[in-house]
Amino acid sequence: EEELQVIQPDKSVLVAAGETATLRCTATSLIPVGPIQWFRGAGPGRELIYNQKEGHFPRVTTVSDLTKRNNMDFSIRIGNITPADAGTYYCVKFRKGSPDDVEFKSGAGTELSVRAKPSAPVVSGPAARATPQHTVSFTCESHGFSPRDITLKWFKNGNELSDFQTNVDPVGESVSYSIHSTAKVVLTREDVHSQVICEVAHVTLQGDPLRGTANLSETIRVPPTLEVTQQPVRAENQVNVTCQVRKFYPQRLQLTWLENGNVSRTETASTVTENKDGTYNWMSWLLVNVSAHRDDVKLTCQVEHDGQPAVSKSHDLKVSAHPKEQGSNTAAENTGSNERNIY
């Protein structure tokens, strides 16, 4: 009788993570009597995957009934495969021995490769906001994929970006891999509604790439432009001065009126109007009673936007240009929350 051979017909097997791997093995003879064991790897550090006689292997099932007399099929199934299961599996015939069975013959091995999907890409922007014309960096990370080949692209509002650097780690063989990419984006004033997208394509995704997004609204700061104007006289002794705060983002804004350098009133932007590009406009006004003033008044609109240093715009109010009101009405005519009487 010809000596037993252990046949592993599949040189390699490719399985998706979470699925069941079937590792095939047959023997050409029942002789000698003794069990089959499966190992991952070879040599002294090999890992026992299944022992027909001893131990508990909850993830492993046999394809056929190994207790049947004429069974020569020693194939196994390993359930719930993860990237950590990748490696070369050997079907090894042992012959009975004491105290341990004696290794008799090994199959040639089957390499198990695990296809694992990349995790959803996570895009993160800079820690601090930046203003238009500045270049900011965005990072994209995805983990746990296998095999190593992967494609990553960056887009801004659907337009592919070219200024980025990508690394896949580790460089050598591994059960799974991670990708890290950094893209440079130049901000424009119109970017409040813009999105940066990181797109990852991998064999496991069957042509349906994963995307991670970052809204530039989280990154951009558009500083306001200020315009202070004097409106036509509402009454003989009153002047309406407005401060138009235009095209700012984000909304967080505090406005202070100064009269001749002294704080007159401070308010926070509340009822703003939104522009099509996502920036905001806001207007504050003062109703100035000029009757009490003998000298010209310098009115300053000072704006602190998003915690940045204040910007201001001033307007000189010529008191002499307006006739003094007869009588002594010094009370403010507060017809709106933004009206202010000058004493």
Partner: antibody, heavy 120, light 107 residues
Framework: QVQLVQSGAEVKKPGASVKVSCKAS????????MHWVRQAPGQRLEWMGY????????KYNEKFKGRVTITRDTSASTAYMELSSLRSEDTAVYYC?????????????WGQGTTVTVSS | DIQMTQSPSSLSASVGDRVTITCKAS??????VAWYQQKPGKVPKLLIY???YRYTGVPSRFSGSGSGTDFTLTISSLQPEDVATYYC?????????FGGGTKVEIK
């Protein structure tokens, strides 16, 4: 290490029954098959039957069918052989012996033997 | 049942001699034959299984051969501790059956 320890010697009258135990240790009891083999004085070894503790499957030598019953208690890792309707020619040393499979009849470990004497 | 006929039933040989014991099966048992050694007052001990595979711990002077119906156990150089009765057994089909034994003694 693997050990099969059998119960002590028995003296029985013809027509009686005897039950011999075999306690296994040092291996997974349910992974191997337990056989019973006897050896009458000056006679060849004689296989009586087996039990597969994994599935409680049994097989008996036709010669003893109806008289021999092999059972097991997996929680105690113990196999039992009961022989009924004893006659003088049943006087023998009874061994339990282990094999790898129910289709494998080569026995790598043996118990120390239990002498059963049938005498009126 | 398959009959196993062993010969000789006994033999006496000198230390260092080559000893051969034969066993004949009444029908083809492929290579499903085992050999056991039983010393006086002791339990049988497995020497060879599947006709030619030496069990672990068994000295290399013991070897088995044969297939089909004719099988041989050879002790290449008899030692004093080899004094025992040797049994062949077929493990091809139930009921497993044993030969009558060969008693080996030292001259």
């Amino acid at each position: 290490q693997v050990q099969l320890v059998q119960s002590g010697a028995e003296v029985k009258k013809p027509g009686a029954s005897v039950k011999v135990s075999c306690k296994a240790s040092g291996y997974t009891f349910t992974s191997y098959v337990m056989h019973w083999v006897r050896q009458a004085p000056g006679q060849r070894l004689e296989w009586m039957g087996y039990i597969n503790p994994y599935n409680d499957g049994t097989k008996y030598n036709e010669k003893f069918k109806g008289r021999v019953t092999i059972t097991r208690d997996t929680s105690a890792s113990t196999a039992y052989m009961e022989l009924s309707s004893l006659r003088s020619e049943d006087t023998a040393v009874y061994y339990c012996a282990r094999s790898y499979y129910d289709y494998d009849g080569s026995f790598d470990y043996w118990g120390q033997g239990t002498t059963v004497t049938v005498s009126s | 049942d398959i009959q196993m006929t062993q010969s000789p039933s006994s033999l006496s040989a000198s230390v260092g001699d080559r000893v051969t014991i034969t066993c004949k099966a009444s029908q083809d048992v492929t290579t499903a034959v085992a050999w056991y050694q039983q010393k006086p007052g002791k339990v049988p001990k497995l020497l060879i299984y599947s006709a030619s595979y030496r069990y672990t711990g068994v000295p290399s002077r013991f070897s088995g051969s044969g297939s089909g119906t004719d099988f041989t156990l050879t002790i290449s150089s008899l030692q004093p501790e080899d004094v025992a009765t040797y049994y062949c057994q077929q493990h091809y089909s139930t009921p497993w059956t044993f030969g009558g034994g060969t008693k080996v003694e030292i001259k």
